[in-house]
């Protein structure tokens, strides 16, 4: 059969019935990530509480993520929520401390149980804060006399956190 | 109808700690952060720094080790310490509320006047 | 830190006449920009933020443009208590900082 003269349409481009069916860039503000679209969809604008982190080209979307004091939230970044302390967690009364025995090591995201460290046969190491997580040492076994001593891992190190920013009103 | 106050102790000395509270009504700091600006007499102005909702704070790396932000909820009240303080700290002191759309001050304060002299 | 320049730094206007601000970043902010309008001996007062979007109670002859690097202010018609300092303000990244401002005076 014939072939259809849009699939010669690259990226960036769409095929344009008003003009005979010829590859036509796609107009600013607008992209086509695959060959052969008929119309070129329009770009993501960052506003708001929303910042852009990759700027819209013809061929890919733009993408957003939150200005400062936001996190994203959602597929894409759809939507984004300010953030809490370390500790905490963001409910619909705003950011509350962790409850004993969980812990929030961000700025965003719930709060999570401490590990069980009986659950794996071993010791409580450092106890956990609301901040971190405890650390689980040797098995009770292991520190039995004449046991080979075990070094203590350290601490993970605590990866920064840059500012979180945002999009518009 | 959403209100900033700040009280502020007008003339301080030199290398001492400057301390601002803003008080807050029409809104709850636990849904809105709160920022603190300054204007020297006759000039721009600067920002100093930001506490969030859920308390967690960011400050103007040039005077980052000098201030501290920090927050009272159940009072509506905002605490500025701003230490070792020089002429140059002279200023109008604002606190303003951050929206929940951008990071931007939509309701600002009336401001205070700091003047640092011995 | 990003610079905001901001010109001119002062302009003189008569009532009725359309008044353009122009506020410069030094590296791309996207749209995050946001205008205020400040009055002597009062604090200052939001007008624009993202770069075009009118805080609520704003009147309609305030309206902003630009993205990236070069924003916009624009009064289209001046009216007696528009007589003020403007600020433009980029809030993509920290340190938030602001215009240097334009005073805004009558002829």
């Known amino acids: 059969g014939l072939q259809d003269p849009c699939s010669n349409c690259p990226a960036g481009t769409f095929c344009d019935n008003n003009r005979n069916q010829i590859c036509s860039p796609c107009p600013p503000n607008s992209f086509s990530s695959a060959g052969g679209q008929r119309t070129c969809d329009i770009c993501r604008q960052c506003k708001g509480v929303f910042r852009t982190r990759k700027e819209c080209s013809s061929t890919s979307n733009a993408e957003c993520d939150c200005t400062p004091g936001f996190h994203c939230l959602g597929a894409g970044c759809s939507m984004c929520e300010q953030d809490c302390k370390q500790g905490q967690e963001l409910t619909k009364k705003g950011c509350k401390d962790c409850c004993f025995g969980t812990f929030n090591d961000q700025k965003r995201g719930i709060c999570r149980p401490w590990t069980n460290c009986s659950l794996d046969g071993k010791s409580v190491l450092v106890n956990g804060t609301k901040e971190r997580d405890v650390v689980c040492g040797p098995s009770p076994a292991d520190l039995s006399p004449g046991a080979s001593s075990v070094t203590p891992p350290a601490p993970a190190r605590e990866p920064g956190h840059s500012p979180q920013d945002i999009e518009g009103r | 109808q959403v209100q900033l106050q700040e009280s502020g102790p007008g003339l301080v000395k030199p290398s001492e700690t400057l301390s601002i509270t803003c008080t807050v009504s029409g809104f709850s700091l636990i849904s809105y952060g709160v920022h603190w600006v300054r204007q020297p007499p006759g000039k721009g102005l600067e920002w100093l720094g930001v506490?969030?909702?859920?308390?967690?704070?960011d400050y103007n790396p040039s005077l980052k080790s000098r201030v501290t932000i920090s927050k009272d909820n159940s009072k509506n009240q905002v605490s500025f310490k701003l230490s070792s303080l020089t002429a140059a700290d002279t200023a109008i002191y604002y606190c303003a509320r951050n929206p929940l759309t951008a990071t931007v001050m939509d309701y600002w304060g009336q401001g205070t006047l700091v003047t640092v002299s011995s | 830190d990003i610079q905001m320049t901001q010109s001119p730094s002062s302009l003189s206007a008569s009532v009725g006449d359309r008044v353009t601000v122009t506020c410069r970043a030094s590296?791309?902010?996207?749209?995050?920009v946001a205008w205020y309008q400040q009055k002597p001996g009062k604090a200052p007062k939001a007008l624009i933020y993202?770069?075009?979007y009118r805080d609520s109670g704003v009147p309609s002859r305030f309206s902003g443009s630009g993205s990236g690097t070069d924003f916009t202010l624009t009064i289209s018609s001046v009216q007696p208590e528009d007589f003020a300092t403007y600020y433009c303000?980029?809030?993509?990244?920290?340190?938030?900082?602001f215009g240097g401002g334009t005073k805004l005076e009558i002829k």
């Open positions: 506490i969030w909702s859920g308390g967690s704070t």
């Open positions: 590296q791309n902010v996207g749209t995050n």
């Open positions: 303000q980029q809030y993509n990244s920290y340190p938030l900082t």
């Open positions: 993202s770069a075009s």
